[in-house]
């Protein structure tokens, strides 16, 4: 007789999840010599231990502590790039500008990027059928708690000038309900962070509006200023040219506004 299984509203664990995490860990440690000491099997065991046999609506930050201990990593605090709703461009940027880091450029962020996972209470099984949806089921699910935890710590680690890439094509360029708006903004440390610099990425080729005047950007400025952190904003009118100029800053066309 098949066991009754909880049906959640969200998609189930990404197929081949254990193999994917392990393979990503091995790849990351090969690419980053400073992380060569990491034992990927232990990393997987700690990752698994965070959610296996636990109710997927009852996950806590503490569940991820063993994983974070194994994922110990040093990133220069003044080279942090946050992003909201524009992940691909942010990652393209840090692939070129190698001394800057998004959360997904860290080992833990790289392991979990774009994956879904959850277990079941009192069984060692991974649930490949469904996982809790943040809105419809519960917020303390394995994926949400993971990203909230690492996003908070990443923001707390930032210092000096922190950059954030925002999507100028969205109706809410700054969204208070995004991870950036609900977690990262509130965990920047005013004793360490002098300025938050927003880069608003334009979508349309002929879009010459100053999106730094957008009401949601003004809202972000207000939140940041109240936290005793300076705010600045730049329009990136041509993201393609922007990336090209990061690759080739000497190019003569790169002196004009991008």
């Amino acid at each position: 007789v098949p066991r009754w299984r909880q049906q959640w509203s969200g998609p189930g664990t990404t197929k081949r999840f254990p193999e994917t995490v392990l393979a990503r860990c091995v790849k990351y440690t090969e690419i980053h010599p400073e992380m060569r000491h990491v034992d990927c099997q232990s990393v997987w065991d700690a990752f698994k231990g965070a959610f296996i046999s636990k109710h997927p609506c009852n996950i806590t930050e503490e569940d991820y502590q063993p994983l974070m201990k194994l994922g110990t990593q040093t990133v220069p605090c003044n080279k942090i790039l946050l992003w909201s709703r524009i992940k691909d461009l942010a990652h393209q940027f840090t692939q070129v500008q190698r001394d800057m880091f998004t959360l997904e450029d860290t080992l833990l962020g790289y392991l979990a990027d774009d994956l879904t996972w959850c277990g079941e209470f009192n069984t060692s099984k991974i649930n490949y059928q469904s996982c809790p949806d943040w809105r419809k089921d519960c917020s303390n699910n394995p994926v949400s708690v993971f990203w909230k935890t690492v996003s908070r710590r990443f923001a707390e680690a930032a210092c000096d000038v922190v950059h954030v890439m925002l999507n100028g094509s969205r109706s809410k360029i700054f969204d208070k309900n995004s991870t950036f708006g609900s977690v990262e903004v509130h965990n920047l440390q005013p004793e360490k962070v002098q300025t938050l610099e927003a880069w608003v990425i334009h979508g349309g080729r002929e879009d010459s509006r100053d999106l730094c005047q957008d009401p949601t950007i003004k809202e972000l400025e207000s939140i940041i200023s109240k936290r005793n952190i300076q705010f600045s904003c730049k329009n990136i009118y041509r993201p393609d040219k922007f990336l090209q100029c990061v690759k080739n800053p000497e190019d003569s066309s790169c002196t004009s506004e991008i």
Epitope: M68, K69, G71, T72, Q73, T74, V75, P76, C77, N78, T106, L108, V150, R153, F154, A157, C159, D160, Q189, P190, E191, K192, Q194
Partner: nanobody, 121 residues
Framework: QVKLEESGGGLVQAGGSLRLSCVAS????????MGWYRQAPGKQRELVAT???????NYTDSVKGRFTISRDNAKNTVYLQMNSLKPEDTAVYYC???????????????WGQGTQVTVAS
């Protein structure tokens, strides 16, 4: 791990000046507050001055107007310029730094070995 190394101590006449330096070395994510503390023989260690990463300073009353703390974030270094020195400033001066070694972990306090400052009357 992290090493804090002080330099610049020595023997000076009352009314003279000294400049202490302290550099933090190791693999560091960030240093929040850096500071100087001192301990005179038979006394408890006491705060002299602190400075945040953004340059906010704090001094103990007895050194205000005479000592100046500064730092170079890029070099993970803190300085203490001591002017108009008095015999009561004689002590071992210790550097302190609140260092974060790992992006996922909290910052911890680290201390230097200390440098002797002697002010002769």
């Amino acid at each position: 791990q992290v090493k804090l190394e002080e330099s610049g101590g020595g023997l000076v006449q009352a009314g003279g000046s000294l400049r202490l330096s302290c550099v933090a070395s190791g693999t560091i994510v960030s240093i929040s507050t850096m500071g100087w503390y001192r301990q005179a023989p038979g006394k408890q260690r006491e705060l002299v001055a602190t400075i945040t990463r953004r340059g906010r300073t704090n001094y103990t009353d007895s050194v205000k107007g005479r000592f100046t703390i500064s730092r170079d974030n890029a070099k993970n270094t803190v300085y203490l310029q001591m002017n108009s020195l008095k015999p009561e400033d004689t002590a071992v001066y210790y550097c302190n730094a609140e260092v974060q070694l790992d992006i996922w972990a909290s910052a911890y306090d680290y201390w230097g070995q200390g440098t002797q400052v002697t002010v002769a009357s």
